[in-house]
Amino acid sequence: VGSGMGTGQRAGSPAAGPPLQPREPLSYSRLQRKSLAVDFVVPSLFRVYARDLLLPPSSSELKAGRPEARGSLALDCAPLLRLLGPAPGVSWTAGSPAPAEARTLSRVLKGGSVRKLRRAKQLVLELGEEAILEGCVGPPGEAAVGLLQFNLSELFSWWIRQGEGRLRIRLMPEKKASEVGREGRLSAAIRASQPRLLFQIFGTGHSSLESPTNMPSPSPDYFTWNLTWIMKDSFPFLSHRSRYGLECSFDFPCELEYSPPLHDLRNQSWSWRRIPSEEASQMDLLDGPGAERSKEMPRGSFLLLNTSADSKHTILSPWMRSSSEHCTLAVSVHRHLQPSGRYIAQLLPHNEAAREILLMPTPGKHGWTVLQGRIGRPDNPFRVALEYISSGNRSLSAVDFFALKNCSEGTSPGSKMALQSSFTCWNGTVLQLGQACDFHQDCAQGEDESQMCRKLPVGFYCNFEDGFCGWTQGTLSPHTPQWQVRTLKDARFQDHQDHALLLSTTDVPASESATVTSATFPAPIKSSPCELRMSWLIRGVLRGNVSLVLVENKTGKEQGRMVWHVAAYEGLSLWQWMVLPLLDVSDRFWLQMVAWWGQGSRAIVAFDNISISLDCYLTISGEDKILQNTAPKSRN
C-alpha cells in the first residue's frame, strides 16, 4: 500500500492458480489501488464523545465494573464464495442463500494489531482467496459460514480509550500478480459482501458481538447497558468510480458487467470478448473502407461481439452518482458494423423506472464513432446499460471505450458511510440509540432509562429530581419572578408528583420576562440525527409567550435562533411531549427558556424530562441532513 501509509494485514493467496493468463499490470497506480478499497473512517469526535459519555475515567470504577469495548469487521460470505466458484467440501453452494440472518454462523480471522495501527495511522486489511476460504469455508467437513469476520476488539478498545485522531480501516483486495481483472473482480465481490464495521461498548455482564438473544438475562444489578454500532456504506453497491468518473478502454480490466458474461474458455463464442487490436487485424474482423484499413485499429484492446442471430447483449456500468447536470455517457463503437445492429442506452436509477438515454453519434477517427448521451444529475444512484441489439444472420459489434464523464462537480459524489447505533435490552430487544435515555421506557424492564442515563454529563438527561441540573438564571432582584424546581402540588397533577422546572406568571402591572439557561453542550457530530426532547405544560392563562432559543458559540460570537415558541395560551393543564430536530448545529451550544408576559397573566409554565439524544454524538447518518420536515413533533 506504499510509503508507510498503512499497515498491511495480508489475508492469504492460494499457491496454485488458474492457467496462466495475461497479467494485469503490477503497478496499478496508487489512485487505482485506492479506488479498489473500501475505507472506513470513524471520526475522532465519535471517540471523544464515546469516551466522555460512556466511559468513566478508569480510576472512578473498579476494573471489574468498567464498560468493555469490542470490534469486528464483517462481510457476507455468499458474494465472496461466488467469486471463487464451486470449491470442494463446501456444504452450501455460493449461489444458494446463506444461513438465516438470526443465526448466521461466522468464523473470525485475526484483525490488525494496535502496534501497527499506532505506527501507520491506518489499518489495511488485505483480503485474498486464501482468507476467503479460511473465513468462509474452513477445514473440510465443517459447515460453511454466512459471515467472515476480522476481530478488531483489541484495536477498537485501545482506540476508544487511549487513541488519538480518527480510526481509519481500509479493506482491499490482496495485491498479487494474477490473471487479468482479478483485483477489480475481488473489489466488486468485497463491495457486494456489504462490509461493515461493528463496535460494541457494554457494561458488565454482556460478552459478545453475537446476537444477544442466546444469552441468559443478567440480573439488573449485574448488567448495566449494551450499545452497538454498525458502520457501513449508505449505498453499499455504489461504485468507487463515482469519485473519479468511469473510463474503461478495455486495455485493463474494468468494473463493467456483461450479459452474457465476458467470453472465456467455458462460454460460447457469441458473448462479449476482449481482444487486442492485432488479433482483430489478423482475423480481418473490421473491414472498413480499403483506404482506412491500415490505420483503422485503435491501439490496445477493445470489446468484440460476434452474434449469429437476433439477440440482445448488454454492458452494465457499476453503480454511480452524479453531482453535475453535464454527466454524460460516452461510448466508442465501430461505425462500419452499425448497419447490422443498433445500440440503445438505458439509465437505471435505484428505485426508479429505467429510461432510455438519447444517444448522439459523433464520427471519430478511423471508422469509430462516439455515441454520447446526457445523463444529468439523477437524484438516486444509478447504473447505465448499453444494449446492442443485433439483427440479421451475422452481426458484429466493437466497443473501444465506455466512459461516464463530467459526473462530479466540486465535492465527491461518492457514497457516504453511515454509523448506525443501537441499544440492546436485557431480553434482546434492539432499540435505536435515540430511544435510550428519552424518558420513555422501551425495554421491558426499563433499562433504557436507567444507570447509563443518570451518569451522562450534566443537562443531558434531566428530570429535575436532583435540582436544576445545570440550568441557571442571571442575577435576580428579589422582586423578579424566578424559575424554580419544585413539584406541582395540586389534585389535578396527581399523575405528575415529581419535580419540574416551573415559572409562575402572576398578574403584574407591567410586562415581565424571565430567562433560564442550560448547561453548555458540545457540538453534535455533523449530519447526526440530533434531537432535543422535553415535556411542557402551561396551566392557566398566559398573556404573552414562551420561547426556546438555541444559542451557538460561533467563533466567539453568540448566535441565537428560536427553535420553539408558544404564545397567548389558554392552558389545558396537560403535559405535552415535544421532539425538536436540532439541525445544522455545528458549534457548542446551550438552550434558553425565555418567558414574557403582561397584564392579565395568571399561568404556571413548566418544563420537565429534558434530554439531548445520544444520537447527536454517537450516530452518523449516511447522507447529509436536508432541511425539510423540521417542524417539532408534539404529542400529549
Epitope: E325, A353, R355, L358, M360, P361, T362, V370, G376
Partner: antibody, heavy 121, light 107 residues
C-alpha cells in the same frame, strides 16, 4: 433572457430542399441540446431529432432519418435543420426547442416561435 | 413507439373552475412525462416536467400527477390566460412522443 429566434416562413416546391435556422441567445449555446419538433393538424406534435452543439453529434427519430439533417454553428450560436426531398406531407410548422436536464429529466424548456413550411407546386 | 393518448380533444370550463386534463401511455413510462402549453398564437411553454415538478415561472395553480400509464394535469382555478392547448410528452423511450393535445376553452 433565453430566446430562440427562428427563420421566416418558407414556400417551396416538391422535391426541393429547405434549411431552417434557429438562433439562440441569452445562454451558453453549447451547454444544451437543441431539439426539433414538427406540428401538423393531422399528426400533432412529432419529435424529429436533436443535436448537441458541443460535439456536433445528432440523433433522429427513425421516421425522419432520411428527411432531416441537423447541424449547429457554434460561432453564431445557430442551429439548422435541412429538410430534403420535400413533399406535401412535409408542410407543417417546425419548432426548435432548447432541452434542459432537470436532475436527469430532459424537458424542452424554451421553444422558438416556429417556422411555417408550405410545400406546393 | 409509445403512443400517448389525450382522450379529450377539447374541454369547456368556466373561470375559477378546477380543470383536469388526462393523458395515457400505451405502456408504463415511469413518471417520465412533461406537460406543455400552446397558446392560440403558436407560442409553446413548458409547464411541468417529470410528472409533477413545476417549471420556474409557472403559476402554482398548475399541478401534475400520475404514475404507470395514467397521468393528469390540473388547473385549480381557471384564469383567462389559461386558454390554450395542452400536450403531454413522454421521454421514457425513444422516440419522444406527444399526446394529441387537449384544447381548453371558456364557457
Amino acid at each position: 433572457q433565453v430566446q430562440l429566434q427562428q427563420s421566416g416562413a418558407e414556400l417551396v416546391r416538391p422535391g426541393a430542399s429547405v434549411t431552417l435556422s434557429c438562433k439562440a441567445s441569452g445562454y451558453t449555446f453549447t451547454d444544451y441540446e437543441m431539439h426539433w419538433v414538427k406540428q401538423t393538424p393531422v399528426h400533432g406534435l412529432e419529435w424529429i431529432g436533436a443535436i448537441d452543439p458541443e460535439t456536433g453529434g445528432s440523433a433522429y427519430n427513425q421516421k425522419f432519418k432520411a428527411k432531416a439533417i441537423l447541424t449547429a454553428d457554434r460561432s453564431s450560436s445557430t442551429a439548422y435543420m435541412e429538410l430534403r426531398s420535400l413533399t406535401s406531407e412535409d408542410s407543417a410548422v417546425y419548432y426548435c426547442t432548447r432541452t434542459r436536464y432537470y436532475g436527469s429529466s430532459p424537458a424542452m424548456d424554451y421553444w422558438g416561435q416556429g417556422t411555417s413550411v408550405t410545400v406546393s407546386s | 413507439d409509445i403512443q400517448m393518448t389525450q382522450t379529450t380533444s377539447s374541454l369547456s370550463a368556466s373561470l375559477g373552475d378546477r380543470v383536469t386534463i388526462s393523458c395515457s401511455a400505451s405502456q408504463g413510462i415511469g413518471n417520465y412525462l412533461n406537460w406543455y402549453q400552446q397558446k392560440p398564437d403558436g407560442t409553446v411553454k413548458l409547464l411541468i416536467y417529470y410528472t409533477s415538478s413545476l417549471h420556474s415561472g409557472v403559476p402554482s395553480r398548475f399541478s401534475g400527477s400520475g404514475s404507470g400509464t395514467d397521468y393528469s394535469l390540473t388547473i385549480s382555478n381557471l384564469e383567462p390566460e389559461d386558454i390554450a392547448t395542452y400536450y403531454c410528452q413522454q421521454y421514457s423511450k425513444l422516440p419522444y412522443t406527444f399526446g394529441g393535445g387537449t384544447k381548453l376553452e371558456i364557457k
